[in-house]
C-alpha cells in the first residue's frame, strides 16, 4: 500500500505564438481545480476508461479575475498535493490523465458551472520511494508543469511497496538476514527468504532468492571481505575487522537516477541506465516514444522512434489534442433546436430543452397544436406548457384515440342505471325519477317537474341523453 502524490507547479500559456485567452474575466470570475486519474501499466486505454489505480480531486484554487488587456498569466493554483492512495503493490508503470477544470463563479442559474480547460495524458515508469519526477505537458496553447512520486505507507517498503517492516524483536539490532527499515530505524524488514547460504551478517535481500552485500563484503553469498586492493585508493574510515579502509560513499550511493533508472559507477563518476520513456543524465527527462503508446482513443502514433524525437498522434474523427484525449466540440454545430442547451458528454450529445419543448434535440413543441391532430373529432387546446385535446363525446386519452366509457363517471342520479350507447349514454331511472340523468323527481300526482314527456315516453322509461 502507498500513496501517489502529484504537485502542480504552474498552469498557464505555453511558449510560442497564439497565447490562449484568459479563462476568467471581470464579468465571469473563476477558479481552477485539478483531477488526476491513474491506471496501471502502459496498456492502450481510452481517456474515459476507469481509473483503476485511483483518482483524486484537488481543492479549489483562489478566485481569479482577468485584468483587461493583460495576457493570460500563470493562473493561481489550489494549495496542497493531489494524493491517490493505492491499496496493493505499486505497478511501476502507469498511465495518467491530469485535467484542469474551471469553475465559473458568475451569476449561474443553479450554482457554479464547470468546464474542462485542458487535459494532458501520458505513460510513465516510476519506482516507489524514489525522488520527485518533474514533467511538462502541453494541451493546445496551455502548459502544465508538475511533479509526482509514489511513496509507500508503513509497514510497506521497496520499489513496489511489497516488502514489509515490523517492529524490532530485540532492542539493538534486527535478526539474521534482516536490516533496519529506513526511514523507520526502530523497525526491521519482515523476513524474506534470501538465497541459500547468504551471509546473515553481511548479506541481505530485497527480493526472495537474492543475496546483496553490505559495504565491505563481496561474493555471491557476501562471505568474502572486499580485497585489500581497495585500500590503495581509500575512500572511507578504517575497518576494525580487516584492518583495511572500507569504501565510503560512492557516486551511486542513494541512487541519483530518477524514475527507476539503475546506477553504475564509472571511473570518473556514474552512469544511469534509464527505463524506456526517460532520458538525461539522471533519467529526469521523460521522453515518451510511440512504443509507449501515448495516443488515446485509437490515435495513430507517428515518429518518436527514440526518446529524442517527438511523436505525433494522428487522431481519428471526433478526437483531438496532442494525445487524442480531447473530443471535438460538436455543440458548435448547434444541433439543439428551439433554444435548447447543448451538452457534449463524449459518448453522446444531450440537449437540455427549454420549457414547452421535448425530444432528443428539443424538436417537439409541447405547446404547439400545429400539425397535432386530435383524433375522432377532438379539438386541440394550447397552454399550460403542454398541448391538450378536448375530445368529442365517447372518446378520451391524450389524442382522443381511446374509446371513453361514458358511464365511468356515474352520471345517472338517484340510483339510475347507466348504459353505454353508440351516441353517448342512456340512464334507466329508478322509480320516482326521470330526466336524461334521472335528475328530476316525479311528483306524486303524476305531474313532473319537467315539461310533458314526449309522446311515447313514460316517466320511469330510460331517458336517452342526446
Amino acid at each position: 500500500a502507498g500513496v501517489f502524490e502529484l504537485q502542480i507547479h504552474s498552469f498557464g500559456p505555453g511558449p510560442g505564438p497564439g497565447a490562449p485567452r484568459s479563462p476568467c474575466s471581470a464579468r465571469l470570475p473563476c477558479r481552477l481545480f485539478f483531477r488526476v486519474c491513474l491506471k496501471p501499466g502502459l496498456s492502450e486505454e481510452a481517456a474515459e476508461s476507469p481509473c483503476a489505480l485511483g483518482a483524486a480531486l484537488s481543492a479549489r484554487g483562489p478566485v481569479y479575475t482577468e485584468q483587461p488587456g493583460a495576457p493570460a498569466p500563470d493562473l493561481p493554483l489550489p494549495d496542497g498535493l493531489l494524493q491517490v492512495p493505492f491499496r496493493d503493490a505499486w505497478p511501476g508503470t502507469f498511465s495518467f490523465i491530469i485535467e484542469t477544470w474551471r469553475e465559473e463563479l458568475g451569476d449561474q442559474i443553479g450554482g457554479p458551472a464547470w468546464s474542462l480547460l485542458a487535459r494532458v495524458a501520458g505513460r510513465r515508469r516510476l519506482a516507489a520511494g524514489g525522488p520527485w519526477a518533474r514533467d511538462i505537458q502541453r494541451a493546445g496553447a496551455w502548459e502544465l508543469r508538475f511533479s509526482y512520486r509514489a511513496r509507500c505507507e508503513p509497514p510497506a517498503v521497496g520499489t513496489a511497496c511489497t516488502r514489509l517492516c515490523r517492529p524490532r524483536s530485540a532492542p539493538s539490532r534486527c535478526g539474521p538476514g534482516l536490516r533496519p527499515c529506513a526511514p523507520l530505524e526502530d523497525e526491521c524488514e519482515a523476513p524474506l527468504v534470501c538465497r541459500a547460504g547468504c551471509s546473515p551478517e553481511h548479506g541481505f535481500c530485497e527480493q526472495p532468492g537474492e543475496c546483496r552485500c553490505l559495504e565491505g563484503w563481496t561474493g555471491p553469498l557476501c562471505t568474502v571481505p572486499v580485497s585489500t586492493s581497495s585500500c590503495l585508493s581509500p575512500r572511507g574510515p578504517s575497518s576494525a575487522t580487516t584492518g583495511c579502509l572500507v569504501p565510503g560513499p560512492g557516486p551511486c550511493d542513494g541512487n541519483p537516477c530518477a524514475n527507476g533508472g539503475s546506477c553504475s559507477e564509472t571511473p570518473r563518476s556514474f552512469e544511469c541506465t534509464c527505463p524506456r520513456g526517460f532520458y538525461g543524465l539522471r533519467c529526469e527527462v521523460s521522453g515518451v516514444t510511440c512504443a509507449d503508446g501515448p495516443c488515446f482513443n485509437g490515435g495513430l502514433c507517428v515518429g518518436g522512434a527514440d526518446p529524442d524525437s517527438a511523436y505525433i498522434c494522428h487522431c481519428p474523427p471526433g478526437f483531438q489534442g496532442s494525445n487524442c484525449e480531447k473530443r471535438v466540440d460538436r455543440c458548435s454545430l448547434q444541433p439543439c433546436r428551439n433554444g435548447g442547451l447543448c451538452l457534449d458528454l463524449g459518448h453522446a450529445l444531450r440537449c437540455r430543452c427549454r420549457a414547452g419543448f421535448a425530444g432528443p434535440r428539443c424538436e417537439h413543441d409541447l405547446d404547439d397544436c400545429a400539425g397535432r391532430a386530435c383524433a375522432n373529432g377532438g379539438t386541440c387546446v394550447e397552454g399550460g406548457g403542454a398541448h391538450r385535446c378536448s375530445c368529442a363525446l365517447g372518446f378520451g386519452g391524450r389524442d382522443c384515440r381511446e374509446r371513453a366509457d361514458p358511464c365511468a363517471a356515474r352520471p345517472c342520479a338517484h340510483g339510475g342505471r347507466c348504459y353505454a350507447h353508440f351516441s353517448g349514454l342512456v340512464c334507466a331511472c329508478a322509480p320516482g325519477y326521470m330526466g336524461a340523468r334521472c335528475e328530476f323527481p316525479v311528483h306524486p300526482d303524476g305531474a313532473s317537474a319537467l315539461p310533458a314527456a314526449p309522446p311515447g315516453l313514460r316517466p320511469g322509461d330510460p331517458q336517452r341523453y342526446l
Epitope: G318, L333, Q334, P335, C336, E363
Partner: nanobody, 120 residues
Framework: QVQLVQSGGGLVQAGGSLRLSCAAS????????MGWYREAPGKQRELVAG???????KYAESVKGRFTFSRDNAKNTVYLQMNSLKPEDTGVYYC??????????????WGQGTQVTVKP
C-alpha cells in the same frame, strides 16, 4: 447505420477555388444538422460551416464571404464551395451529421476526411 461519403478537395493555389460534397446514406429518418469541420495542422478541429438544428446556416468568421454552404435535401447531400482560398485554409475537412435514425433516436456521424492544401 449511417455513412457519410466525402468528395472533392485537393491541392490549389492561393486565390483558387474548390468544392467539397458530402452525401449521407443508410438508415436516415431525418437529418437534424450537418456541416463541415476543419482540422488544421497543430490546431483544434473547428466548425467551418453548416446548418444547425434550427435550420439556420452558420459560418466561421474566418470564411464568411468566401465560402458558401448549400444543401440538397432530396439527396441528403451538403456542399461547401470554397473561393478565394488562403494558405490558412489548409487542413483536413471532415463532414459531420447529426442524424435521426428514427423518430426518437439521434446520433452523430463523421465522414472520412478530405485533405485541402492551399499553396502560397
Amino acid at each position: 447505420q449511417v455513412q457519410l461519403v466525402q468528395s472533392g478537395g485537393g491541392l490549389v493555389q492561393a486565390g483558387g477555388s474548390l468544392r467539397l460534397s458530402c452525401a449521407a446514406s443508410g438508415s436516415i429518418f431525418s437529418i437534424n444538422a450537418m456541416g463541415w469541420y476543419r482540422e488544421a495542422p497543430g490546431k483544434q478541429r473547428e466548425l467551418v460551416a453548416g446548418f444547425t438544428g434550427d435550420g439556420m446556416t452558420k459560418y466561421a468568421e474566418s470564411v464568411k464571404g468566401r465560402f458558401t454552404f448549400s444543401r440538397d435535401n432530396a439527396k441528403n447531400t451538403v456542399y461547401l464551395q470554397m473561393n478565394s482560398l488562403k494558405p490558412e485554409d489548409t487542413g483536413v475537412y471532415y463532414c459531420a451529421a447529426d442524424v435521426f435514425t428514427d423518430r426518437d433516436h439521434v446520433d452523430w456521424y463523421w465522414g472520412q476526411g478530405t485533405q485541402v492544401t492551399v499553396k502560397p
